[in-house]
């Protein structure tokens, strides 16, 4: 039950996670103007990873694209890569973690294989959360580095007389939305990995270990880590009675690699 | 077609206030800012403020700060602008003007103005 | 605040002349977001109201004669009238619409000689 609560748990997590990290790749406001200057301004600025916008005080607001492609700074292109990289992850990782699901069932899919597809998605959501909040990050230190530069040479013009003043940007709403959702994307992630150690053993087919005994020989079937921690329902882990003599050295075992997870 | 139209011109003492309107019709009230400008006889322009009608969020030029009180009335689509502690620098004729959308912040509809005399 | 100087302060002239003012700011009225110029003319014929003739530095209102033309950009802005007529004897106002708090220039009159 309890593995079955995480699974879900950590599936609802990582939706909500990859879900914000498309809403902030989308988003217009990765960098606003600074109104430390000027907080009341007729012209208020903003940017975002495809666009750069402007709105006017009548409420109008106009767009444009970024209509070039080897123009962009490298930086830009690599948060973009970075945000995409994570979104097709993330989407990926929902896809396999939908089937993945213990509360659904699909034919007769085998409980191991559950178990990796769950272990598989969790990853996949690892690293679709720090790809967001690498991009978040790089587009931040960008944007730092930027308003210092432009602090610096915050007013040009000819003897003082003429002020040109550069527009400085401040980190937007989007900034934010993508670093909370790259960590719900990753929390979600590892809820996930953990989700998977308690299914694997309970997926996993054992091969019953005989011990030699003088009357009859009764062979235990390990539960194994789901035994010991008491997750759902240990229903596999029964006495089977066998009339055969088998040495321990005759009988193979197969463990899963989850086991030592 | 966009109208705006102002209240009649107002004689005042030192000291008191008056309350002036503009009466917006032909477009929707709340979809424009509603600025005021005052006008010193033979002098320039000087920006009062402005008001938000949806929001009646004000804002004031530093100068006016306490002079001027700017508000809205939704229901009647009138914009009013009370002026108090009266003195002769009040003497001018004040406008209201919408701000244009799509007009780079500029003002394409304005008020035919309301002159006000202060005089003891 | 952003000072907008306007010269000349008068203009005598002729009907069917050829007229330019110029305004200029103390501060680009250029903003970088878009490129776009934050500047607009009025014409105030005497006893009336302004009224909006160029806006964006370079944009003409609707039901503006086409003998009225704006140019300029970041700090430096022109005022044109191709061909002046009788109507057109009026103050002539630039005003800046990037900053708060808006300004004006204390305008250009136009006179017939």
């Known amino acids: 039950m309890a593995v079955t609560a995480c699974q879900g748990l950590g599936f609802v997590v990582s939706l909500i996670g990859i879900a914000g990290i498309i809403a902030a790749t989308c988003m217009d406001q990765w960098s606003t103007q600074d109104l430390y200057n000027n907080p009341v301004t007729a012209v208020f600025n903003y940017q975002g990873l495809w666009r750069s916008c402007v709105r006017e005080s009548s409420g109008f607001t106009e767009c444009r694209g970024y209509f070039t492609l080897l123009g962009l700074p490298a930086m830009l292109q690599a948060v973009r890569a970075l945000m995409i990289v994570g979104i097709v992850l993330g989407a990926i990782g929902l896809l396999v973690s939908i089937f993945a699901l213990k509360c659904i069932r699909i034919g007769s899919m085998e409980d191991s294989a559950k178990a990796n597809m769950t272990l598989t998605s969790g990853i996949m959501f690892i690293v679709s959360g720090l790809c967001a909040i690498a991009g978040v990050s790089v587009f931040a230190n960008m944007l730092v580095t930027n308003f210092w530069m432009s602090t610096a040479n915050m007013y040009t013009g000819m003897g003082g007389m003429v002020q040109t003043v550069q527009t400085r940007y401040t980190f937007g709403a989007a900034l934010f939305v993508g670093w909370v959702a790259g960590g719900l994307t990753l929390i979600g992630g590892v809820m996930m990995c953990i989700a998977c150690r308690g299914l694997a053993p309970e997926e996993t087919n054992y091969k019953a270990v005989s011990y030699h005994a003088s009357g009859h020989s009764v062979a235990y079937k390990p539960g194994g880590f789901k035994a010991s921690t008491g997750f759902g329902s240990n229903t596999k882990n029964k006495k089977i009675y066998d009339g055969g003599a088998r040495t321990e050295d005759e009988v193979q075992s197969y463990p899963s690699k989850h086991d030592y997870v | 077609q966009v109208q705006l139209q102002q209240s009649g011109a107002e004689l005042a003492k030192p000291g008191a206030s008056v309350k002036m309107s503009c009466r917006a019709s032909g477009y929707t009230f709340t979809s424009y800012l509603m600025h005021w400008i005052k006008q010193r006889p033979g002098q320039a322009l000087e920006w009062i403020g402005y008001?938000?009608?949806?929001?009646?969020?004000?804002e004031y030029n530093q100068k006016f700060k306490g002079k001027a009180t700017l508000t809205a009335d939704k229901s009647s689509s009138t914009a009013y602008m009370q002026l108090s502690s009266l003195t002769s620098e009040d003497s001018a004729v004040y406008y209201c003007g919408r701000l244009g959308y799509y007009k780079r912040n500029a003002m394409d509809h304005w008020g035919q103005g309301t002159s006000v005399t202060v005089s003891s | 605040d952003i000072v907008m100087t306007q010269s000349p302060s008068s203009l005598s002239v002729s009907a069917g002349e050829k007229v330019t003012m110029s305004c200029k700011s103390s501060?680009?009225?250029?903003?970088?977001?878009?490129?776009?110029?934050?500047l607009a003319w009025y014409q105030q014929k005497p006893g009336q109201p302004p009224k909006l003739l160029i806006y964006g530095a370079s944009t003409r209102e609707s039901g503006v004669p086409d003998r009225f033309t704006g140019s300029g950009s970041g700090t430096d802005f022109t005022l044109t009238i191709s061909s002046v007529q009788a109507e057109d004897l009026a103050v002539y106002y630039c005003?800046?619409?990037?900053?708060?708090?808006?300004?004006f220039g204390a305008g250009t009159k136009l006179e017939l000689k």
């Open positions: 005003q800046n619409d990037h900053f708060y708090p808006l300004t």
């Open positions: 501060q680009s009225l250029l903003n970088s977001g878009n490129q776009k110029n934050y």
């Open positions: 008001i938000n009608p949806t929001t009646d969020y004000t």
